[in-house]
Structure formats: C-alpha cells, structure tokens
C-alpha cells in the first residue's frame, strides 16, 4: 500500500522527506518564513496528511501563500509612502510613515520605516507594531514678524505672525477674551475669563457665575476683531478646567484650560505656541497680542500687539504695594516705567510670548491677567506666569513641546 511520491509546495517543505510512503505514514507540510499554508482558503501554520490503506493521500498538498500585512493603519496627521513597487503589502515589503510637514513632526525623530513581518504585522525597529505619533509643531509661524518698532500704545499685528492666538467669543460673535493654542486641542487662557465679574462684597464663585462649555466658542486663525475671513476656524468647547489654586479675589493662578471639541486644522494661520523651557529673564522683550481696548478706550479693528520688557518682580511688587495688591510668584510683570504700552480690557487671557533666537521658536511666557487701569505710569501689566504653572498645564493636557 504505497502512496504516490509527494512534491513539496513552492516555498514550502514536507517532513519527514522519504523516498517512499506507506499506509499510516504521516507528513507535515509547512512553509518557508514569510509564507503561510493555504488550504481551502484557510490560512494555517502547518497541515498534516496521511497515507491511506488504499494507497492514496488523505488530502491534496496545500499551497504556500506569501504573508500579507494588508493596508497599513492610517496615521493621524501623517502620510504613508510605499517603498516597494506596486504598493506591495506582502512579507518584507516596506512602508514609510511621515508627518504632515511643516505643521507636524514625528515624536522622537522616529524613522517611520515599517517592514511587513513573517507574522503578518507591520513592524518598526523601535516602536514594534505601535504607530508613530505626529505632534504639532509649535511656535514656528510661516510668516515672520518684521522687527518691532518701539512704538506707543501698540500697533496692528501682521496677519499670520501670531497663529497661536485664540479668540474667546460669545455665541453671538461678541469677543470677550483671548487665549493661546496649546498642542492640537487645548486653549490656555485666564481663569477670570471663564466666570462673570464677582461682587466685591461677596467674591465667591458660584455655579451660575461660571461659563458653561456651551456658552462660548473658540475662534482660531482670526485677524479682524469683528469681520470674518477665510482663515478662521470656529470650534466648540468640550470642557473647561480652572487652575485648582485660582483665587478670583487676588487673581492668584489666574489660568485656565479649555479643551476643544475637535482639533483645528493646523496651517499657516493656526499653529500652537510652545510651552516655556525655563524661567523668563528680567529685561527680556516680550510681545503681547489682543483685540482689547486701545488708547481712547476704543476697540481695534484688527489684532494688535505691543513689545515690552519683563519687569523685575520686586519692582512690580513695590509698584502695587500702595494699592494693597499682591504680586505673587505665579505672576510676572511687563511694561515700561513711563507707561503707555500695556494690555487692556478685552486682552485678558491672551498671549505674552518671547522669541528664542537660537531656535527661532516662540514660547509662551504669560497670559494677560490684571493691572491698574491701562498703560499707567509706574503701573506694570501683570500676567499669569506660565513657567510657574507649566507642570499643571502638562498634567492636564499632556502637551510637550
């Protein structure tokens, strides 16, 4: 009862390999690395057949089919390029993930190269089967600012030079505060922007005083205060988080985070700002932007900005001591002794940024918080100091530069 000679499948082998096979002999069919046994459209690792009493084999020899990793997973804010001809997705094929430059960059400078493994999964040398991450690029506007002139009372900002600025707007389109985009779905603003003005006689924060996420919206890519343009993105609010140590009486820790319902499309007019890497030096020049009141108490038509120096903390404390106002460690002051250049009503929550010349990148130093009137002599603008609360911001948002 001898069974016919067996031919191993292409890219496969049979074991044991014998010259002759007799009744009850069994053989195991397996495939080379990167191939799978295919029998009746079912993939398996091995297949066993037996020599029957009547001298026939219990089954036909299966085929060996190359492993297919199939279409690779999509990468958020990324692209896939196939390194192999005809966009092959089979064993040993190679693909490369890249991020949508210049607005996204790959985390940890990963190569993004994935190879189709013998197990049928796309594998990267460092990340294994995990996909890379495309992080938003921060603080690198496409449009670079002309050198700032030392000018009185601010000047119109050039369009696109402050792509991180956010406008907090009532649903009727009335702006009420500023903010800055962090990462791909967070806005940092002033905590006092998210509640109604409190009664000085009873400065307690009640539920009814707080803005609900459905009460306002965020507008990014905005230039004109009231006019719309094609670069604007209007986004809903998912959740608001006030700093847990915020004090509405003293404006201590006057910072809040707004989580967006959806991520904006990053482009030349919408880009996040970088979080500070270290403390800010006294005398450093910063730029403050906003749609707040101008000289003569008028609101501007477009986004305005001023360039002012950071003021020594003790100088600022002394300036406010006669008013019995405390300038705490979570605050940073900026402005000129003679006054004239300052943030004002409507600017609250907006960004105070500085340029790191070595990297050519802009960093958030503070958010507009409070002051005594606007642009007064010997009364500096007081800002919530982002470096002081960077840990909290990162805890809540997970944003890293």
């Amino acid at each position: 009862n001898e069974c016919p000679e067996l031919q191993p499948p292409v890219h496969g082998k049979i074991e044991p390999s014998q010259a002759k096979y007799f009744f009850k002999d069994q053989v195991l069919v397996s495939c080379d690395t990167g191939y799978k046994v295919l029998k009746d459209n079912v993939e398996m690792d091995t297949f066993q057949i037996e020599c029957l009493k009547d001298g026939t084999w219990s089954n036909k020899i299966p085929t060996c089919k190359i492993v297919d990793c199939r279409a690779p997973g999509e990468l958020e804010h990324g692209l896939i390029t196939f390194s192999t001809r005809n966009n092959l997705t089979t064993y040993k094929s190679e693909i490369k993930y890249s991020c949508q430059e210049p607005y996204y960059k790959m985390l940890n400078n990963n190569t993004g190269i994935y190879t189709c493994s013998a197990q049928g999964v796309w594998m990267n040398k460092v990340l294994g089967r995990s996909l890379p991450t495309c992080l938003p690029v921060c603080g690198l506007p496409k449009f670079s600012r002309k050198l700032m002139a030392r000018i009185f009372n601010g000047r119109p900002a050039q369009k696109g030079t402050t792509p991180w600025i956010a406008m907090l707007s009532h649903l009727n389109g009335q702006p009420f505060c500023g903010g800055s985009l962090l990462g791909s779905s967070w806005i940092v603003t002033a905590a006092h922007c998210l509640h109604q003005s409190l009664d000085p006689e009873d400065p307690t924060l009640r539920d009814s005083d707080l803005l609900s996420p459905s009460d306002f919206k965020i507008i990014l890519g905005k230039h004109w205060r009231l006019r719309s343009d094609e670069n604007e993105q209007h986004l809903g609010v998912k959740h608001t988080t006030l700093h847990p140590q915020y004090d509405p009486n003293t404006f201590e820790n006057d910072v809040a985070l707004v989580e967006l319902l959806e991520s904006p499309v990053l482009n030349a007019f919408v880009m996040p700002i970088c979080l500070p890497e270290g403390p800010q030096q006294e005398g450093a020049m910063v730029i403050v932007s906003g749609w707040g009141k101008q000289f003569l108490q008028r609101f501007p038509e477009t986004l305005m900005e001023i360039e002012i120096p950071i003021v020594d903390h003790s100088t600022c404390q002394k300036a406010y001591a006669p008013l019995k106002k405390k300038v705490t460690r979570d605050m940073i002051c900026a402005g000129e002794k003679e006054g004239g250049k300052d943030a004002c009503a409507g600017d609250a929550g907006g960004p105070m940024v500085t340029l790191n010349r070595e990297r050519g990148q802009w960093y958030l130093v503070g958010t507009v918080s409070w002051g005594d009137d606007c642009g007064k002599k010997d009364r500096y603008g007081v800002y919530s100091y982002i470096h002081h609360n960077k840990d909290w911001i990162q805890r809540v948002t997970g944003v890293r530069n």
């Epitope: 924060l205 140590q245 915020y246 003293t250 201590e252 705490t328 979570d330 840990d391 805890r395």
Partner: antibody, heavy 113, light 112 residues
C-alpha cells in the same frame, strides 16, 4: 520633605484651640496648605486651604468654625469654639495643584466636658 | 458643591485577585480626581491624580480610569499590604468658592 502637626489635646467645649503645622525641606511661605480632619472611625473631611498669598478658602460647613492663618514658618488652624463633634485627628497636607501630596502624621483633638 | 459617592464598604477579594472601587461625581469634574490609600493608624497616601496618572513610586498594580463622571480605582494582583481604606478626592474648581476640595466617603478593602 515632611510636615508635622502639633497642638492637639483634650479641651472642653467652647475653648478655642490652635493647631500648628511646621514643615521641613520646603518653605511654607510659598506653599499651599490644606487642613483635613478625620473623626474616629470615619472618613476624611476637607476643612480649608491657605494659599501662598495668604488667602484662605473653607468648606461650606467649616466657615466661621475654623480660621487658617500662616507665618513664615507655620500654618495654623484655629478651632474657634470646639464642640464634641470636632473630636478628630487633624492633618495638614501640602496642596499640589489640588491634590494633597505630602501629609503630616496628624494630631488628635478631643473635645469633652 | 460636588458630591463624591464611593462603592460601599467593605470590598473583599483574595490575595492575587483584582478589586475595583468606583467613585461617582455628582457633576462633571473633567479628570480632576485623585485617589488616596489610608492604612489604619497612618496618614493618607496619594496614589493617583488626574483620574489616571500614577504617582511616582506607586506600584503599577494600581490603575485609575474615568468614564464621564464615574471614576474607578483598580488594584490587581492583590497583596496583603493593600488592605486599607481608599478615598477619592475632587479638586475641580466649579460651584462655590467653598468646597474647593472634597473627599468621597471611603471604601475599605479587605484581603481574604
């Protein structure tokens, strides 16, 4: 880094009592400090917090019954007019963005006539 | 003010088992929730903040999660040393300026 409470003792109802919290390894003047209490066999109850600036916030049930204050080296909790319900272990705990990351061992206050 | 309602005590599980404690917030508090462990005669110890971030030095057997206003603390591969009372704490700045921090009632975990 550590904190320690002191001043807990047996007092008669209505007799004001001040508890003190001292710290080592960090400065209380720039810290945010909570007071929390725990009655025997019961859960934790937040009393209030004092900010770096010195401003204070209290739980609604604690307003008027407790006063938190600070010096450069201590944070104090005054129980203005203790009642038997104020018998508890009182903890001071450093506030780290809303969470209490460093606790003292607690000091026991017993209010009894 | 935000009210936190915890799983009723005691919760019992064997050594090597898994236990999950729940904490329900009366309103949306985002992820502003922490978990503490308190052993008899000791002060509380912070385990988790931001609903799911483990404090440095705390065993990875502890994990936290959030689903809307319901928060969970899971302890896996239970050890005798895990026998304690666990508290959730809210630090979301919302309603009144009072009650800036609130604790749940606590859940006692017993190891069989």
């Amino acid at each position: 880094q550590s904190v320690e409470e002191s001043g807990g003792r047996l007092v008669t109802p209505g007799t004001p009592l001040t508890l003190t919290c001292t710290a080592s390894g960090f400065s209380l003047s720039s810290a945010y400090m909570n007071w929390v209490r725990q009655a025997p066999g019961k859960g934790l109850e937040w009393i209030g917090i004092i900010y770096a600036s010195g401003s204070t916030w209290y739980a609604s049930w604690a307003k008027g019954r407790f006063t938190i204050s600070k010096t450069s080296t201590t944070v104090d909790l005054k129980i203005t007019s203790p009642t038997t319900e104020d018998t508890a272990t009182y903890f001071c705990a450093r506030d780290d963005y809303g969470t209490a990351d460093l606790w003292g061992p607690g000091t026991l206050v017993t209010v009894s006539s | 003010a935000v009210v936190l309602t915890q799983t009723a005590s005691p919760v019992s599980a064997p050594v090597g088992g898994t236990v999950t404690i729940k904490c329900q917030a009366s309103q949306s508090i985002g992820s502003s929730l922490a978990w503490y462990q308190q052993k008899p005669g000791q002060s509380p110890k912070l385990l988790i903040y931001g609903a799911s971030t483990l404090v440095s030095g705390v065993s990875s057997r502890f994990s936290g999660s959030r689903s809307g206003t319901e928060f969970s603390l899971t302890i896996s591969d239970l050890e005798c040393a895990d026998a304690a009372t666990y508290y959730c704490q809210n630090y979301y700045l919302s309603s009144s300026s009072a009650d800036r921090r609130t604790f749940g009632g606590g859940t006692k975990v017993e190891i069989k």
